[in-house]
Each structure stands twice: as structure tokens, then as C-alpha cells.
């Protein structure tokens, strides 16, 4: 297993609709044809997997059916979007990139993006 640098923004603020997007960029040492991207969430020293996708050549990442993530890729950049976020989901979201093929296998883990989610205030009653 060889190490690889992964960069991602330090902080992202989710939209009022609970959507957060960020770019995960990896320094590929060679021409990988199969890449696996995993988003991990770290909160209270616990790490859980949020979503993962394996992609090849194309620019659309395909996630499992119940995933809250969507994404696209362009070169060594992956554009990730996480949906359905609520205030309780605030935390550090870490991008993990694995170059699965061809060998050698490379692994890179970013420093994480702190995603802040603020639940929208309920609209006050109005006469209008």
C-alpha cells in the first residue's frame, strides 16, 4: 500500500435545504483506471462511512441506492454532494481515495471538511 495526497476544503456550510458540496482532489502518481472514493464522517471520535463509489473513465459516480451522496469526477478531482443533512449531521467529513487498478494500490485520506448544518427556522405565521 502506497500513500497518496488528498486535498479537500477545511470548511463548508450546508445550504438551507441541507445540501453540502465539496471537491476532493487526489495527487495520482500514475494513470489509474479504477478509483474508489469513500466519504467518512468523524464525530465524537467515532468514524462512520457515509457513502462510497467506484468509478472508471466516465465522469459520473454511481452510489448505492440508499446513499445520500451524488458525485461527478473530472481528472483527479471528485465533486461530492451530500444531501438530506440536518443540524445533528454537523461534523468532519473525510474523503478517502483508493487507486484500485492498475497496481500498485494507493491510498489517500484527506484532512476532512468540517460541514456545518443549521436547521432552517420554521416560517412564522403570517396574515399574507
Amino acid at each position: 500500500c502506497k500513500a497518496m495526497h488528498v486535498a479537500q476544503p477545511a470548511v463548508v456550510l450546508a445550504s438551507s435545504r441541507g445540501i453540502a458540496s465539496f471537491v476532493c482532489e487526489y495527487a495520482s502518481p500514475g494513470k489509474a483506471t479504477e478509483v474508489r472514493v469513500t466519504v467518512l464522517r468523524q464525530a465524537d471520535s467515532q468514524v462512520t462511512e457515509v457513502c462510497a463509489a467506484t468509478y472508471m473513465m466516465g465522469n459520473e459516480l454511481t452510489f448505492l441506492d440508499d446513499s445520500i451522496c451524488t458525485g461527478t469526477s473530472s481528472g483527479n478531482q471528485v465533486n461530492l454532494t451530500i444531501q438530506g443533512l440536518r443540524a445533528m449531521d454537523t461534523g468532519l467529513y473525510i474523503c478517502k481515495v483508493e487507486l484500485m487498478y492498475p497496481p500498485p494500490y494507493y491510498l489517500g485520506i484527506g484532512n476532512g471538511t468540517q460541514i456545518y448544518v443549521i436547521d432552517p427556522e420554521p416560517c412564522p405565521d403570517s396574515d399574507f
Epitope: 483506471t33 479504477e34 467506484t54 468509478y55 472508471m56 473513465m57 466516465g58 465522469n59 459520473e60 454511481t62 452510489f63 448505492l64 441506492d65 446513499s67 451524488t70 458525485g71 461527478t72 484500485m100 487498478y101 492498475p102
Partner: antibody
Framework: QVQLVQSGAEVVKPGASVKVSCKAS?????SYWINWIRQAPGQGLEW???????????YYNEMFTGRVTLTRDTSTSTAYMELSSLRSEDTAVYYC????????WDQGTMVTVSS | DIQLTQSPSFLSASVGDRVTITCSAS?????IHWFQQKPGKAPKLLIY???TLASGVPSRFSGSGSGTEYTLTISSLQPEDFATYYC?????????FGQGTKLEIK
């Protein structure tokens, strides 16, 4: 030029298995997904699953989980789809298609399940 | 699973007509891709990533849309365009296709 060539038509009995091959040429086999899709007579397209030929990573349509197995042989640039416990509803044309974009298809393999 | 619903399922039109086929997704998708299939033949990639024409596809074909609503438009129907058209999503597994739109000569 890019080409996918599948094995010939099969007639199989209910409960049996069938293994369809898809030989790729004209491109780097390990650089693109091989997808498997089927089409029952007069019906639409149904995705079965896909395999990454380099690592062997597979994704399946849960509708087929436990009955379908996708494999590949990189030495011959050939992908395989095996479907077991066949029933009459599995009668269909089975296609392999290349990559994320499904940009190249073979003409398909007709599998008929009949007693 | 993400369901894709195409409308109409059947469409009768004449050479030279402008036709539009819609594809509605049960959940927001990143892109929609379109295929054309003629009887007895394998499907052929027509448009990928919502609006990019595949190699060799005539410019009378175009695609647009976002979120859950997408369209395929043929600006001026040619005799060779009479076929069945399918939309497809690859945002989540399982990959799914629409039920198809059969375009027939009026």
C-alpha cells in the same frame, strides 16, 4: 476498432444454469466496466450488473442477487455472466455493453428457458 | 430504486416533425442518458450526460433537463429515426432504464 463478441444462443431447461461470454477487443479491457443487460421479448431493458475487469469489483441488481455471477478472464479479455435457477421469465436477449457510457454493445445472446 | 417514466410510451409522427420525449425520475439524478433501439438490433448510445451527443449522432438530436425532468428532442424527424428510445440513469445502483418510447410513422 472496439468490438464485443458474445457466445451463441442457448436453450436451457428450467432450474438449470447458463453462462454467457463476452469477448472484448480493440481497447484496453481493464479500463472500462463491462455491463450486462437483458431484454425479454417485446419488453424494455433491464440492467443485471457490472464488473470492473481490472480488480474484479462487481455490482449487481438486487433483483438477481444470489442467481447471477459476473466474472472475467483478463488474459483473454473475456467477461462472463452466469445465471442460475433459470425460469421461463428469464427467456431474453442478454447483452454486454462497455463502460460507464454503454457506448459499445454486442448484438446479444438469446437465452430460451423451456422444458 | 430510481424509477424512470417516459412519456409518451407511443408516439406517431411524420418525417420533418419536431418531437419531444420526456423522462421523469422518481428522485433527482445527476444526468440522464438516451439510447435508440431498432427492431432486432442492440441499443445504440445517442446522448450521454444529459446533453452530449455520442460520436456520429446527427445534430438534430438534442437533450436537456436537470433534477427529475429530462427531455430528448428530435428537431426534424428523418425516416431512420423511427425506433424505440430509452432513457437511463447511472446516479445510483441499480442502474435503471425508462420503459421506452416507440416512435412510429404516422
Amino acid at each position: 476498432q472496439v468490438q464485443l463478441v458474445q457466445s451463441g444462443a442457448e436453450v436451457v431447461k428450467p432450474g438449470a444454469s447458463v453462462k454467457v461470454s463476452c469477448k472484448a477487443s480493440g481497447y484496453t479491457f481493464t479500463s472500462y466496466w463491462i455491463n450486462w443487460i437483458r431484454q425479454a421479448p417485446g419488453q424494455g431493458l433491464e440492467w443485471i450488473g457490472r464488473i470492473a475487469p481490472g480488480s474484479g469489483t462487481t455490482y449487481y441488481n438486487e433483483m438477481f442477487t444470489g442467481r447471477v455471477t459476473l466474472t472475467r478472464d483478463t488474459s483473454t479479455s473475456t467477461a462472463y455472466m452466469e445465471l442460475s435457477s433459470l425460469r421461463s421469465e428469464d427467456t431474453a436477449v442478454y447483452y454486454c455493453a462497455r463502460g460507464d457510457y454503454f457506448d459499445y454493445w454486442d448484438q446479444g445472446t438469446m437465452v430460451t428457458v423451456s422444458s | 430504486d430510481i424509477q424512470l417514466t417516459q412519456s409518451p410510451s407511443f408516439l406517431s409522427a411524420s418525417v420533418g416533425d419536431r418531437v419531444t420525449i420526456t423522462c421523469s425520475a422518481s428522485k433527482s439524478v445527476s444526468y440522464i442518458h438516451w439510447f435508440q433501439q431498432k427492431p432486432g438490433k442492440a441499443p445504440k448510445l445517442l446522448i450521454y450526460d444529459t446533453s452530449t451527443l455520442a460520436s456520429g449522432v446527427p445534430s438534430r438530436f438534442s437533450g436537456s433537463g436537470s433534477g427529475t425532468e429530462y427531455t430528448l428532442t428530435i428537431s426534424s424527424l428523418q425516416p431512420e429515426d423511427f425506433a424505440t428510445y430509452y432513457c437511463q440513469q447511472r446516479t445510483t445502483y441499480p442502474l435503471t432504464f425508462g420503459q421506452g418510447t416507440k416512435l412510429e410513422i404516422k
